[in-house]
């Protein structure tokens, strides 16, 4: 079942799940001048079954410009350079995530995908919160949240974090250095 | 929690226009496709067309084209349809909703007689 | 256009009993068809989206199948308060379009 609200806010503090529990949403957005086609879902659905999961349907972004056509516009060197680093950044990241029954890995970046990916998670999804740089974390438990139903309502648990002062940003599980991105993660990984 | 509030009814002479809103709480506006959805009793439910307020993109069924038009302020995270020209045949329930995950707003009830 | 036929106007079950609304879309649509509860006078309540998966807060009596061009909502243990008007929409091509809907009435 689809998680109601989105993880709690943390300030400082950005999230991403390791693996995406099936019936997880990621929805086809495109970055400023893009959109998606108007052929095929709206979103990518985690799919499958206890053995394999991978996303099912594909995003495709277009020039909002040139309208009813799937013509992809060639990046500006800029774009290049970044999208180069978030699929680096994502393969760096593949590797380090266990395969999970029921679960899919960090889908890869599409053309011309918007900065921030928009997850809509699942009952018995676990997000992992580390400070942004700059900020040092002060645990008082967990730093995860988890997505639970009680009472027929979902919530999501409260991260026991609090990100202060000036140091070296943590780190999430499986990942031996901090991420090169200014924020502590490539944007292609952080939701709402 | 998301919310999609309209307003319950219109009532409005044909041949002029109207424009029902939809403000949207709960959630990102600018990060989600917005619906228009029609509803007559004998003809189910129609996709008029949607918005994405992030980038002000719009997509239209064709067969609302010229009838229906789709705006959103952000400012106030409200979403509009105007339709114009009205006739009898346009009387019927409108309904705002967000494309995904599906939420959709109470509707407007929409009457048009002289 | 995608034309989305659901067959049975209406269906008339009993509390308890298990019942099952179609709907056959005119081409594939894959699984991206979505399932609406409308009761009078209120707005389409969201069910099933991807075929299958239930949104929250939907207990799990509902369940949604099917893939292609074929569609099933089976509602097992029927209650009163499942009486309502049940619609199907497919969103896998613009314009996205829905089923005529089908009534389930409790006798």
């Known amino acids: 079942e689809l998680c109601d609200d989105d993880p709690p806010k943390i300030t400082h503090a950005t999230f991403k799940a390791v693996a995406y529990k099936e019936g997880t949403m990621l929805n086809c957005e495109c970055k400023r001048g893009f959109r998606r086609i108007k052929s095929g879902s709206p979103y990518m659905l985690c799919t499958g079954n206890s053995s394999h999961s991978s996303w099912d349907n594909q995003c495709q972004c277009t020039s909002s410009a040139a309208r009813n056509t799937t013509k992809q516009v060639t990046p500006q060197p800029e774009e290049q350079k970044e999208r180069k680093t978030t699929e680096m950044q994502s393969q760096m990241q593949l590797a380090d995530q266990v395969s999970l029954p029921g679960h899919c890995r960090e889908p890869p970046p599409w053309e011309n995908e918007a900065t921030e990916r928009i997850y809509h998670f699942v009952v018995g999804q676990t997000v992992y919160y580390q400070c942004v740089q700059g900020y040092r974390a002060l645990h008082r438990g967990p730093a995860e949240s988890v997505c639970k139903m009680t009472h027929g309502k979902t919530r999501w648990t409260q991260p026991q974090l609090i990100c202060t002062g000036e140091t070296e940003p943590s780190q999430f599980p499986g990942e031996e250095e901090p991420q090169a991105s200014p924020d502590g993660l490539p944007e292609s990984e952080t939701s709402r | 929690q998301i919310q999609l509030q309209q307003p319950g009814a219109e009532l409005v002479r044909p041949g002029t226009s109207v424009k029902i809103s939809c403000k949207a709480s709960?959630?990102?506006?600018?990060?989600?496709?917005l619906g228009w959805v029609k509803q007559r009793p004998g003809h189910g439910l129609e996709w008029i067309g949607d918005?994405?307020?992030?980038?002000?993109?719009?997509n239209y069924n064709e067969k609302f084209k010229g009838k229906a038009t789709l705006t959103a302020d952000t400012s106030s995270s409200t979403a509009y349809m105007q339709l114009s020209s009205l006739t009898s045949e346009d009387s019927a329930v409108y309904f705002c909703?967000?494309?995904?995950?599906?939420?959709w707003g109470q509707g407007t009830s929409l009457t048009v007689s002289s | 256009d995608i034309v989305i036929t659901q067959s049975q106007k209406f269906m008339s079950t009993s509390v308890g009993d298990r019942v099952s609304v179609t709907c056959k879309a005119s081409?594939?649509?894959?699984?991206?068809v979505a399932w609406y509860q409308q009761k009078p006078g209120q707005s389409p309540k969201a069910l099933i989206y991807?075929?299958?998966y239930r949104y929250s807060g939907v207990p799990d009596r509902l369940t949604g199948s099917g893939s292609g061009t074929d569609f099933t909502l089976t509602i097992s243990n029927v209650q009163s308060e499942d009486l309502a008007e049940y619609f199907c929409?497919?969103?896998?091509?613009?314009?996205?379009?829905f089923g005529g809907g089908t009534k389930l009435e409790i006798k």
């Open positions: 081409q594939n649509v894959g699984t991206n």
């Open positions: 918005i994405y307020p992030g980038g002000g993109y719009t």
């Open positions: 709960g959630y990102t506006f600018t990060n989600y496709w």
């Open positions: 929409q497919q969103y896998n091509r613009y314009p996205y379009t």
């Open positions: 991807s075929a299958s």
């Open positions: 909703a967000r494309v995904t995950p599906a939420s």
